[in-house]
């Protein structure tokens, strides 16, 4: 009683003329005429057409013929009601209607699940005119059905501002299971339980799931989709997949690797990016993370001097950006540097140790016993000092920098002089008379300029005054520098 076609249903034949019989509203089936060679027979329907309407939405024409007989109502003839076919197969189905020739413009549209099918669909409408009526066959074909073609299809015809709607043709596409959720790769803690999920749909339903671990089935009995596999724990890496079975066959999910979290590998390629007297900028390439994100890293620094006490300085930093500036180091010193990083499981081993050196430092002490006196005859200021006690890490003395500031009547002028490392005296020209000259001296190495000595002041009188005794920095423990006259 249900009119349906199976997937092997072939296209309807092209009828050589109009359908036999006049317009009908009963359920007498539409019989095909003998088919042309090369065509398969039309689908045949049971004579009673049960499950089909006797009444419905039909257009009742108001026009009458010459004999003034009212025309019968218009309705689509009944066609196949249910088509079951496999994915990727082709299908063709049609709607047919006989329309009195008094109607000129008739268009048939196809609709699926309430939406009009436009564009890239294969819809063909054929007209077979006769004396009084024109048989119209609207065919719809899909060359390779997809799951998305599943649905209820209807024809609509606009005529005389009326809409005539066919009964539906149910298209049921069946195929291999289609995954809607596949297991995903995970990184898990050793011997800790975890879940994997697999979900697949038909039609046909039901879809049953088998789990596979390292090519062996986990469950002997299938589980209904969706399926959650609880793995009690792993001690080594494993590959899981799921098989989805339905009446059409089997689909296998992608295989996913489940990794066991471990401590990271040690960093590699620790390198020196930049060195200063008291800091070293290092970078490193992180090792394998052990399937768990790095949390932070530890930089270990040892003095390379065999005479050192061997203590290790530890600097903690974030795992990114694989760069760290080690500070508070001694100048002109050698260090061994190693890097270790950690994840949630623990610390990696230390990277291979590398040697690094700080550069020379600037002097840490100012020149001592700075003395300043005026040589009025030559209009010069003579400056003398003692070489500072330089430490080894301060590097080699390359000279001195002398700052002399001249202040007179609200005017202040600073000048700098550079002096070679050999001497311990200098002479500067008087810049301004009737002014105070303030002198400071700093030692200079390749590592930079050291601290300046305490200022020594000397008053430079106007021309014709007597010589003055020198000014000097005080002996240690004395008060501020004084001007000695």
């Amino acid at each position: 009683a249900i009119t349906e076609a199976r997937e092997e249903a072939k296209p309807y034949p092209l009828f050589p003329g109009p359908f036999p019989g006049s317009l009908q509203t009963d359920h007498t089936p539409l019989l095909s005429l003998p088919h042309a060679s090369g065509y398969q027979p039309a689908l045949m329907f049971s004579p009673t057409q049960p499950g089909r309407p006797h009444t419905g939405n039909v257009a009742i024409p108001q026009v009458t013929s010459v004999e003034s007989k009212p025309l019968p109502p218009l309705a689509f003839k009944h066609t196949v009601g249910h088509i079951i076919l496999s994915e990727h197969k082709g299908v063709k189905f049609n709607c047919s209607i006989s329309v009195p020739n008094i109607y000129q413009d008739t268009t048939i549209s196809w609709w699926k699940d309430g939406k009009e099918l436009l564009g890239a669909h294969h819809a063909i409408t054929q007209f077979y005119p006769d004396d009084e009526v024109t048989a119209i066959i609207a065919s719809f074909s899909i060359t390779s059905v997809q799951r998305s073609d599943n649905g209820s299809y209807i024809c609509k015809m606009k005529i005389n501002n009326e809409e005539i709607v066919s009964d539906p043709i149910y298209i049921e596409v069946q195929g291999l299971p289609h995954f809607t959720k596949q297991p995903e790769s995970m990184n898990v803690t050793r011997n800790t339980a975890f879940n994997l999920t697999c979900q697949a749909v038909g039609p046909p339903e039901p879809v049953n799931i088998f789990w596979v671990q390292n090519s062996s089935r986990v469950n002997e009995q299938p589980e209904k989709s969706p399926s959650v596999l609880t793995v009690p724990g792993l001690t080594e890496m494993a590959v899981f997949s799921c098989e989805a079975h339905n009446d059409k066959g089997l689909t296998v999910s992608k295989g996913v690797q489940i990794n066991i979290k471990a401590i990271p590998s040690p960093p590699t390629e620790v390198s020196i990016r930049n060195s200063t007297a008291h800091s070293i900028l290092i970078s490193w390439v992180p090792g394998f993370d052990g399937y768990s994100p790095f949390r932070n890293c530890s930089i270990q620094v040892k003095e390379a001097d065999p005479l050192s006490n061997g203590s290790v300085m530890i600097f903690n930093t974030s795992a990114l950006p694989h760069l760290y500036q080690i500070k508070q180091l001694q100048a002109l010193a050698n260090y061994s540097i190693g890097v270790s990083c950690m994840n949630e499981i623990g610390w990696s081993a230390v990277s291979p140790w590398i040697l690094a050196s700080t550069t020379e430092g600037a002097p840490s002490v100012a020149p001592l016993n700075v003395t300043v006196f005026l040589n009025e005859s030559s209009d010069n200021v003579d400056i003398r000092w003692m070489k500072p006690p330089t430490k080894q890490q301060d590097g080699e003395l390359v000279g001195y920098r002398i700052s002399h500031v001249w202040q007179s009547a609200g005017i202040s002028k600073e000048l700098l002089e550079e002096v070679g490392q050999n001497g311990s005296r200098a002479r500067i020209s008087v810049q301004v008379h009737n002014a105070t000259c303030t002198v400071r001296i700093a030692a200079v190495t390749r590592g930079g300029v050291g601290p300046f000595s305490d200022p020594v002041k000397i008053f430079i009188p106007a021309h014709g005054w007597v010589d003055y005794a020198p000014s000097s920095t005080p002996a240690p423990g004395n008060a501020d520098p004084v001007l000695i006259i």
Epitope: A1, I2, E4, P53, G56, H82, D113, G114, I164, D167
Partner: antibody, heavy 118, light 112 residues
Framework: QDQLQQSGPELVKPGASVKISCKAS????????IHWVKQRPGQGLEWVGW????????KYNERFKGKATLTADTSSSTAYMQLSSLTSEDSAVYYC???????????WGQGTSVTVSS | DAVMTQTPLSLPVSLGDQASISCRSS???????????LHWYLQKPGQSPQLLIY???NRFSGVLDRFSGSGSGTDFTLKISRVEAEDLGVYFC?????????FGSGTKLEIK
């Protein structure tokens, strides 16, 4: 989620009529047949008929011709069944159900109880 | 009309047992194109019927694999491999091959 929501219980007098409703949601109402099924208390199920909301076409079980009238309002996605000239024999729970693509009644309403009593 | 005879009317079972319900039609339910429109439903107390098996042997979406259907022509069987408490209710067969559509009289599955 495809759903059919039926109207509430009805208590009617003999000889009267009643119209019960079935509101569809979650799918294209005009594309699938709606069937109606009767179940008398403690008894089996009896098919009343169907309507195709897309064109209003109907088909009835001979036993319910003249008793049941099936209609549909596409603007509200609601199917109706009117029962007329009610007697105690019409007291039952009436279900609406959708004929799905698999050509089975796949989704059912929760049922509407009709009690005919004076 | 296609008369559907369902047996037994009542089926007492123990939890975990297998249950088997038969449905026989007065005429073949095979359609001219080879499909058989015989479906099985479960109606739990106070609920609407719910589809279990469609077209003889296809489990509907969400139905557990404990339920299986078989048969052809006029004789059909629903099997429940391991009965659980949630399976209790009345089971109906329905044919939609011939109009009017007809239901079986129902089988009440109950605990022994």
């Amino acid at each position: 989620q495809d759903q059919l929501q039926q109207s509430g219980p009805e208590l009617v007098k003999p000889g009267a009529s009643v119209k019960i409703s079935c509101k569809a949601s979650g799918y294209s109402f005009t594309s699938y047949y709606i069937h109606w099924v009767k179940q008398r208390p403690g008894q089996g199920l009896e098919w009343v008929g169907w309507i195709f909301p897309g064109n209003g076409n109907t088909k009835y079980n001979e036993r319910f011709k003249g008793k049941a009238t099936l209609t549909a309002d596409t603007s509200s996605s609601t199917a109706y069944m009117q029962l007329s000239s009610l007697t105690s024999e019409d007291s039952a729970v009436y279900y609406c159900a959708r004929l799905g693509l698999i050509y089975a009644l796949d989704y059912w309403g929760q049922g509407t109880s009709v009690t005919v009593s004076s | 009309d296609a008369v559907m005879t369902q047996t037994p009317l009542s089926l007492p079972v123990s939890l975990g047992d297998q249950a088997s319900i038969s449905c026989r039609s007065s005429q073949s339910l095979e359609n001219s194109n080879g499909n058989t429109y015989l479906h099985w439903y479960l109606q739990k107390p106070g609920q609407s019927p719910q589809l279990l098996i469609y077209r003889v042997s296809n489990r509907f979406s969400g139905v557990l694999d404990r339920f299986s259907g078989s048969g052809s022509g006029t004789d059909f069987t629903l099997k429940i491999s391991r009965v659980e408490a949630e399976d209790l209710g009345v089971y109906f067969c329905l044919q939609v091959t011939h109009v009017p559509f007809t239901f079986g009289s129902g089988t009440k599955l109950e605990i022994k």
